[in-house]
């Protein structure tokens, strides 16, 4: 008993130690070691029968998908995949875990959010953080210089998620990327077109795509007096401007990141600007910015991009925003992020963003990081933030109290009398063999009312009713669940009649 009390005390102390280290923002390695110790102590403690039983739940930042949620998810995926295929993309898949080395040094300050796996026989492994780095590894490994691909899969981040806003530790990403040497801004414009097509098709509300360029950011930082070593960390501060005020961002840059106040003010003059192609033109005339080679290249490309976006008919959805500084280290050129807009409280106010639903950019150097000779494969891509979209679609359907079908069953094989199980089994098998989505109730003698009720609840449109008289006459009674009208259909015509009524092609091609 004393032993257990001692262990409980140590578990408590170790828990406090871990919390303290997290609050102090101690190194990831130290926190990881102390968490491992805590888990070992807890394991030795074992279950305590006197304590409350094990709480059955999914791990923090994860969730189960109910049939209803899965139906929503499949509809969303269907819209996205159709769009990706319409644009000529192939599909690939990669392992859910990568060698830790593959992911290291690719995400900047976000690296601390990577999930490391416990040692599995020598290889240090991590769960993938996104689909882009594995894609770059795939290109380098297979010596590919040209591909247009999409990849839909789960990724993992040790974030502290606000799940109510559609943020998780395990979540899907839907990525589309174009790899290869092409003329400037054509693939980039297509990525933005795809983003707009998908967000419009999903009908989740009005959206805006913010566009910037890493080279413009870097050039701007250089002329404002930010040292090279601080570029990335200042980037991550600037990127918060969509969530907090300039004052807060400035305080962070000056107070926490050691930037001189006058340098921060110079940055502020730039990053608080947003507009369209006219802002690009204006900055091309900026006496300081136009003298910076990187910024000039970026501005030139953005001018060209806006031309293509106009031809694609989406320029009204795009805003050049100098505060967009996506956190990932691998971006080298154009970067973009789509945000949903809330309706402004009063007319004349700026539209308010409610979080990113898609993002992407150009990353010309990432593949080269994996190539022994450093050979670069230019890439540009986008990622759809489907978890947030699922949340929005679910909320919208709940508000509309819309019934969602969770199965695709076209017909229920039913019987009106007892002792017809064998006939039901024969008929349902015929229907399955003909490619009809059919079900039957798993009871020998179900009541007709129960069978009809099941159809109502499951949204099954048709019932094929077998009766003794129908068997003698060689017909099946086909009943429409909603209109309740019944017709006798010859057994040999039943498949064709069901397909006709449910709008299914007459052959399984």
């Amino acid at each position: 008993m004393a032993e257990r009390a001692a262990l409980e005390e140590l578990v408590k102390l170790q828990g406090e130690r871990v919390r303290g280290l997290k609050q102090q923002k101690a190194s990831a390695e130290l926190i990881e070691e102390e968490v491992a110790k805590l888990l070992k102590l807890k394991a030795q403690l074992g279950p305590d029968e006197s304590k409350q039983k094990f709480v059955l739940k999914t791990p923090k930042g994860t969730r189960d998908y109910s049939p209803r949620q899965m139906a929503v998810r499949e509809k969303v995926f269907d819209v996205i995949i159709r769009c990706f295929k319409r644009h000529g993309a192939e599909v690939i898949d990669t392992p859910v875990f990568e060698l830790k080395e593959t992911l290291m040094g690719k995400y900047g300050e976000d690296s601390k959010l990577i999930y490391d796996l416990k040692d599995q026989g020598g290889e240090l492994l991590s769960l993938r953080y996104d689909l882009t780095v594995p894609f770059a590894r795939y290109l380098a490994m297979n010596k590919l210089t040209n591909i247009k691909r999409y990849h839909i899969a789960k990724v993992y981040r040790r974030d502290n998620p606000a799940m109510t806003r559609g943020r998780y530790r395990e979540f899907y990403q839907c990525d589309f990327d174009i790899a290869g040497n092409f003329d400037p801004m054509i693939p980039d414009a297509e990525c933005l077109k795809i983003m707009c097509e998908i967000l419009s098709s999903l009908q989740i509300g009005d959206f805006l795509v913010k566009v910037n360029d890493r080279r413009i950011l870097d050039g701007m930082f250089a002329i404002c007096g930010v040292s090279d070593s601080k570029f990335r960390t200042i980037c991550s501060s600037v990127d918060k401007l969509d969530k907090v005020s300039w004052e807060e961002v400035k305080n962070e840059m000056v107070g926490e990141k050691g930037l001189a106040p006058e340098v921060a003010d110079r940055i502020g003059d730039y990053v608080q600007q947003h507009g369209g192609v006219s802002l690009v033109e204006q900055l091309l005339q900026d006496p300081k910015l136009s003298q910076n080679k990187q910024a000039l290249e970026g501005l030139g490309d953005l001018k060209l991009l806006f031309e293509y976006l106009t031809l694609f008919g989406i320029d009204d959805k795009i805003s050049f925003d100098l505060s967009l500084a996506r956190g990932l280290d691998y971006y080298t050129g154009v970067i973009y992020e789509a945000v949903l807009l809330q309706t402004p409280a009063q007319a004349g106010e700026e539209p308010l963003g409610v979080g990113s639903v898609a993002a992407g950019g150009r990353y010309d150097g990432l593949v080269g990081m994996f190539d022994p000779k450093g050979r670069k494969v230019p890439c540009v891509g986008l990622s759809i933030g489907v978890e947030r979209i699922f949340s929005i679609v679910e909320q919208r359907l709940e508000a509309l109290e819309e019934k969602i079908r969770t199965t695709e069953t076209q017909v229920l094989v039913a019987s009106a009398q007892k002792k017809l199980l064998e006939e039901r089994l024969k008929l349902v098998s015929e229907l399955w063999d003909a490619g009809i989505k059919a079900e039957l109730l798993y009871k020998k003698n179900p009541k007709l009312l129960n069978q009809l009720q099941y159809c109502e609840e499951a949204g099954i449109p048709l019932v094929a009713i077998i009766g003794e008289q129908e068997l003698k006459d060689g017909v099946i009674k086909l009943r429409s669940v909603t209109s309740r009208e019944e017709v006798d259909v010859r057994r040999e015509d039943l498949v064709e009649e069901i397909k006709r009524r449910t709008g299914q092609p007459l052959c399984i091609c």
Epitope: A6, E16, R17, E33, K37, K40, L41, Q44, K118
Partner: antibody, heavy 120, light 107 residues
């Protein structure tokens, strides 16, 4: 019963090297963090280094960092301390010890110690 | 590094006496403290861990208390085999440090 037996101590010249071993028995060696602690003649105790059961975590006192390397062989139930560039002030009895409750940095079982003398 | 200071550095007592040894930490260490007993030419022996938990097999006359920066080891009734040097050790953060020791001698 738990037993820890150190070996490998002896007389060595400054700048020389020595490898200490600690043979463990009577417990599941791979479950436990292990540590080396030393005691200079007539002095107090000094924590030198530790290693986790899975080899993943190690640490060293500043006074030995870069010169000493801790390692273990779980198959042989053995703990090691490779000591290079030895100095006079490394002269001490070196004890290996097991962490209490596998992971708590307190030695619940200690070896009898092995004497390392660094002298020209 | 966290400094551990023991007092007194030596104490003389008789069999049956109650003895208290104090250990102070240079910063708060919660209850991450252990007490050891060491006899000449022998390895230290763990008495108390987590400031007040008695290691199995250690007589109940030994007890520990305290948390934060101030800790005590108490021997309620000294026995002949208790004459030795006692060390405290913090297990809060690496490098884990020991007190300089308190020598308990026969009066």
């Amino acid at each position: 019963q738990v037993q820890l037996v150190e070996s490998g101590g002896g007389l060595v010249k400054p700048g020389g090297s020595l490898r200490l071993s600690c043979a463990a028995s009577g417990f599941t060696f791979s479950d436990y963090y292990m540590t080396w602690i030393r005691q200079a003649p007539g002095k107090g105790l000094e924590w030198v280094s530790y290693i986790s059961g899975s080899f993943r975590y190690t640490n060293y006192a500043d006074s030995v960092k870069g010169r000493f390397t801790i390692s273990r062989d779980n198959a042989k139930n053995s703990l090691y301390l490779q000591m290079n560039s030895l100095r006079d002030e490394d002269t001490a009895v070196y004890f290996c010890a097991r962490y209490v409750y596998q992971v708590v940095a307190i030695g619940d079982y200690w070896g009898q110690g092995t004497l390392v003398t660094v002298s020209s | 590094d966290i400094q551990m200071t023991q007092s007194p550095s030596s104490v003389s007592a008789s069999v049956g006496d109650r003895v208290t040894i104090t250990c102070r930490a240079s910063q708060g260490i919660s209850s991450w403290l252990a007490w050891y007993q060491q006899k000449p030419g022998r390895a230290p022996k763990l008495l108390i861990f987590a400031a007040s938990s008695l290691q199995s097999g250690v007589p109940s006359r030994f007890s520990g208390s305290g948390s934060g920066t101030h800790f005590t080891l108490t021997i309620s009734s000294l026995q002949p085999e208790d004459f030795a040097t006692y060390y405290c050790q913090q297990a809060k953060s690496f490098p884990y440090t020991f007190g300089q020791g308190t020598k308990l001698e026969i009066k």
